[in-house]
Amino acid sequence: TTTEVVMENVTAFWEEGFGELFEKAKQNNNNRKTSNGDDSLFFSNFSLLGTPVLKDINFKIERGQLLAVAGSTGAGKTSLLMMIMGELEPSEGKIKHSGRISFCPQFSWIMPGTIKENIIGVSYDEYRYRSVIKACQLEEDISKFPEKDNTVLGEGGITLSGGQRARISLARAVYKDADLYLLDSPFGYLDVLTEKEIFESCVCKLMANKTRILVTSKMEHLKKADKILILHEGSSYFYGTFSELQNLQPDFSSKLMG
C-alpha cells in the first residue's frame, strides 16, 4: 500500500477576516440556546480571534483506507477537510496527499439541470453511473420521476426532499473519479435505514478501494473505519484503530463503549 494522505504537526488559524465573520455570526446566535438546555456550540472554535482552529494534528492514511473523523461541534472536523482541500493554509506543519479530491459537503446543493447532469458533471460512464445510483439508493426515486434521470431539478423543475438532495450530493461526489474522497457528515438528512444501506453499499463496498475520510458521530461507523481521529477543541484527542480506542484507560473506554 502507498501512503495517500499525511498530516504532520499541522496547526492552522483562520485569517482575521474569517475570524471576524464567524465572531459576528456567533454574536448573532448568542441568544439561541438549543431547546434541551445545552448552550449552542455554533462556531465555538472561533470564540477568540487568533485561536488556532487546528493544533498539532498528525495522521497518516494508506491508499484504500477509511478514516473516520469524530468530535463535538466546533472541534475542527470541517476545518480539517478544508485544509486538505487547500481552502485553509497551515501556519505550521505539512500536508501531503496524492492529488484529485472529491468533496461531499454537509449541506447538499443542487444545480439547475437534470438529475443525471447533477451527478455526472462532464464525462459519462454508464457502468459507473449505474453503480453509483444503486449504491446511493437513488434507483427507486428516479424510477418514480416523470422523466426518470432526465427530470429537471432547480428553477422550473421538480422539488426534491432533503433525503433525495443528500443522496444526489453524495452520488455526485462518489461518481467523480478521485484519489481521495472527503465526506462531511453526508448522512445528516437521511433516515437511519437508508443511511445504513448507503454506508454499507457505497462507503464500504463501492468505494472499498478508495481512500475516504468520513466525518461522523456514529459509533457504528467508527467500528468499521480503518483509523479513527477524534478532534477536541482543534486538537487530536485520539488517533488509532477502534480496538486501540477500546483499550484506552478504563474510565474513558467504558464511557466510550457504553
Epitope: 438549543t34 432533503g162 433516515d191 459509533m219 467504558s254 466510550l256 457504553g258
Partner: nanobody, 123 residues
Framework: QVQLQESGGGLVQAGSSLRLACAAT????????MGWYRQAPGKQRGMVAI???????DYADSVKGRFTISRDNAKNTVYLQMNSLKPEDTATYYC?????????????????WGQGTQVTVSS
C-alpha cells in the same frame, strides 16, 4: 440506560386521525435525528418521517400532506400527527432516535428503537 416508548396507537376508521408520541428517557445528553418507521405484516420496515435536531423534516411519498412529524427537544419527545388515515397505513409504528448518552464523550451517537405501537385502520 436509554429507552424509547411509543404511545397513541389504536384501531380507527379510514379518514380519521391519530397522534403518536415517543418519549426518550434515561441518561441522555443530546438527540440528533428522530423518526417514525413502520412495518406491515410480511413487509420490510420503512421510513415514514424524520426530523433533524433543528426541525428539518422529510416524509415518505405515501404520507406527504397527511402526516406531520414534530418534536419537543426539551421533553426529548417526537410526535406523528396522522390525518386522513387509510387502510394501507395499518402497521406497527416504530420510533427511532440517534442519541448521545450522558456518559458518551465527544457527542458520539448510537441508534435506539422503540418497541412499536400498533395502528390499525379499518375500511
Amino acid at each position: 440506560q436509554v429507552q424509547l416508548q411509543e404511545s397513541g396507537g389504536g384501531l380507527v376508521q379510514a379518514g380519521s386521525s391519530l397522534r403518536l408520541a415517543c418519549a426518550a428517557t434515561g441518561s441522555i445528553r443530546s438527540i440528533n435525528n428522530m423518526g417514525w418507521y413502520r412495518q406491515a405484516p410480511g413487509k420490510q420496515r420503512g421510513m415514514v418521517a424524520i426530523i433533524t435536531r433543528v426541525g428539518n423534516t422529510d416524509y415518505a411519498d405515501s404520507v406527504k400532506g397527511r402526516f406531520t412529524i414534530s418534536r419537543d427537544n426539551a421533553k426529548n419527545t417526537v410526535y406523528l400527527q396522522m390525518n386522513s388515515l387509510k387502510p394501507e397505513d395499518t402497521a406497527t409504528y416504530y420510533c427511532h432516535a440517534e442519541i448521545t448518552e450522558q456518559s458518551r464523550p465527544f457527542y458520539l451517537t448510537d441508534d435506539y428503537w422503540g418497541q412499536g405501537t400498533q395502528v390499525t385502520v379499518s375500511s
